[in-house]
């Protein structure tokens, strides 16, 4: 995840200019003590990505994202791999050598998108791994 | 990944006391401009984890770990999911709302471990997801 910044007052509206219509997305790094790895709300507007000229439908989708700390001890909710558990222990002993595991999607879902291809044909395609179903420490 | 720290002189030997015998592991965050997401060397000694009393063999194993930036544009080497590509674009536009994707294992291998169980029986067990085979942006 990105570096931590100082807390700022970011009371977002759902207007297009403001925040990609990312309803109920707070600042992902508002305090020095980050919360544990979990799934967060994120609505992605294809217009805001500049894809509105080729994507017909949907207008956007609930993508979600993963963020948070993967700190010792990793509990069951964190869907940690064996490697992540080992890496957490190594980080605990040698914090300057190895980072903590990172909070990443463990399960992703597909969405269907209707779009114009390069030849202006309308294509209905299923795009894999577009929506976060669950997050874990990896 | 963890926060960046100031560069320190850490010329590690492979001795056990010093660095968990993490041969050729440099500081994972030595400069403000992190390198791109990739696989790094990491040897894990079960002794250093305090597991020497119940693990008979091996003494340790090459676990590797993933670290580095997942910045725009994500190239083919970064094994990025569709969601990671979308998240990178959203982060580019709204850096305070959503973190960059994180560098995490995309493929993991198992190792076999010989150990004593609670009844002092010797067990040979295959532990899944112990060794990083490849890293990617998630």
């Amino acid at each position: 995840a990105a570096n931590k910044r100082k807390n700022q007052n970011r009371n977002k509206s759902s207007s297009h200019q403001d925040s990609s219509r990312m309803s109920s997305v707070g600042d992902y790094n508002t305090s020095e003590q980050k919360q544990a790895c979990k799934k967060h709300e994120l609505y992605v507007s294809f217009r805001d990505l500049g894809w509105q000229d080729w994507i017909i439908a949907p207008e956007g989708y609930a993508a979600f994202y993963c963020d948070g700390e993967c700190s010792f001890p990793l509990n069951a909710h964190m869907n940690a791999t064996n490697h992540a558990i080992v890496q957490t222990l190594v980080h605990l002993m040698f914090p300057d050598h190895v980072p903590k595991p990172c909070c990443a999607p463990t399960k992703l879902n597909a969405i269907s998108v209707l779009y114009f291809d390069d030849s202006s044909n309308v294509i209905l395609k299923k795009y894999r791994n577009m929506v976060v179903r669950s997050c874990g420490c990896h | 990944a963890a926060n960046k720290r100031k560069n320190q002189n850490r010329n590690k030997s492979s001795s056990h006391q010093d660095s968990s015998r993490m041969s050729s592991v440099g500081d994972y965050n030595t400069s403000e401009q992190k390198q791109a997401c990739k696989k790094h060397e990491l040897y894990v000694s079960f002794r250093d984890l305090g597991w020497q009393d119940w693990i008979i063999a091996p003494e340790g194993y090459a676990a590797f770990y993933c670290d580095g930036e997942c910045s725009f544009p994500l190239n083919a080497h970064m094994n990025a999911t569709n969601h990671a590509i979308v998240q990178t674009l959203v982060h580019l536009m709204f850096p305070d709302h959503v973190p960059k994707p994180c560098c995490a294992p995309t493929k993991l291998n198992a190792i076999s471990v010989l150990y004593f169980d609670d009844s002092s029986n010797v067990i040979l067990k295959k532990y899944r997801n112990m060794v990083v085979r490849s890293c990617g942006c998630h």
Partner: antibody, heavy 121, light 108 residues
């Protein structure tokens, strides 16, 4: 139920700009694609272009250089402007709705009743 | 662009007869993205069929659509007096969206 009503001048001089407005009632314009189609007297139908309520547009390449479609969500209206008109642009101009979901994109339903625009000096 | 050719140009039939209208595309219409409309004099077109074969809401079951690829058909199983009109096909599988030239179904 949703109804569409075209309005604008019935007579436009050659080389001037044709301006029409479609008012949508019975439904919010804040979904769907909104389209313009024309039909010269005694001839077939020609799609002009469409707009999404958030402003993205798609035009028929044959008319693209002369056409602008815009939307006013506060008035539940969308508009057509066609510049440099000639007698060949004389037609009945229809506005129509296109569904904007994956399962129902691309056909026109419903239509406005149409308005005849004559280009003549 | 995809050119749609409708045939025949005019179909002269009596009430109660079966009408078969053809729409041929210059290239394949993806996913059967084809619609049919009915237009009566002085009125706007009305959607009959979408997706090549799905009837629009309120359309009688004597109207049916079929076909895929480049060849599509609209069938009216038994012509009623109110069915005499001009029929247009429209493809939305490629941009620009295009219409056929129309088939006029007239009373014999």
């Amino acid at each position: 139920q949703v109804q569409l009503q075209e309005s604008g001048p019935g007579l436009v001089k050659p080389s001037e700009t044709l301006s029409l407005t479609c008012t949508v009632s019975g439904d919010s314009i804040r979904s769907y694609y909104w389209s313009w189609i024309r039909q010269p007297p005694g001839k077939g139908l020609e799609w002009i272009g469409y707009i999404y309520y958030r402003g993205s547009t798609h035009y028929n390449p044959s008319l693209k250089s002369r056409v602008t479609i815009s939307v006013d969500t506060s008035k539940n209206q969308f508009s057509l402007k066609m510049s440099s008109v000639t007698a060949a642009d004389t037609a009945v101009y229809y506005c129509a709705r296109i569904c904007s979901s994956i399962s129902c994109w691309g056909w026109f339903d419903p239509w406005g009743q149409g308005t005849l625009v004559t280009v003549s000096s | 662009e995809i050119v749609l050719t409708q045939s025949p140009g005019t179909l002269s039939l009596s009430p109660g007869e079966r009408a078969t209208l053809s729409c041929r595309a210059s290239q394949s219409v993806s996913s059967s993205y084809l619609a049919w409309y009915q237009q009566k004099p002085g009125q706007a077109p009305r959607l009959l069929i979408y997706g090549a074969s799905s009837r629009a809401t309120g359309i009688p079951d004597r109207f049916s659509g079929s076909g895929s690829g480049t060849d599509f058909t609209l069938t009216i199983s038994r012509l009623e007096p109110e069915d005499f009109a001009v029929y247009y096909c429209q493809q939305y599988g490629s941009s620009p969206l295009t219409f056929g030239g129309g088939t006029k179904v007239e009373i014999k």
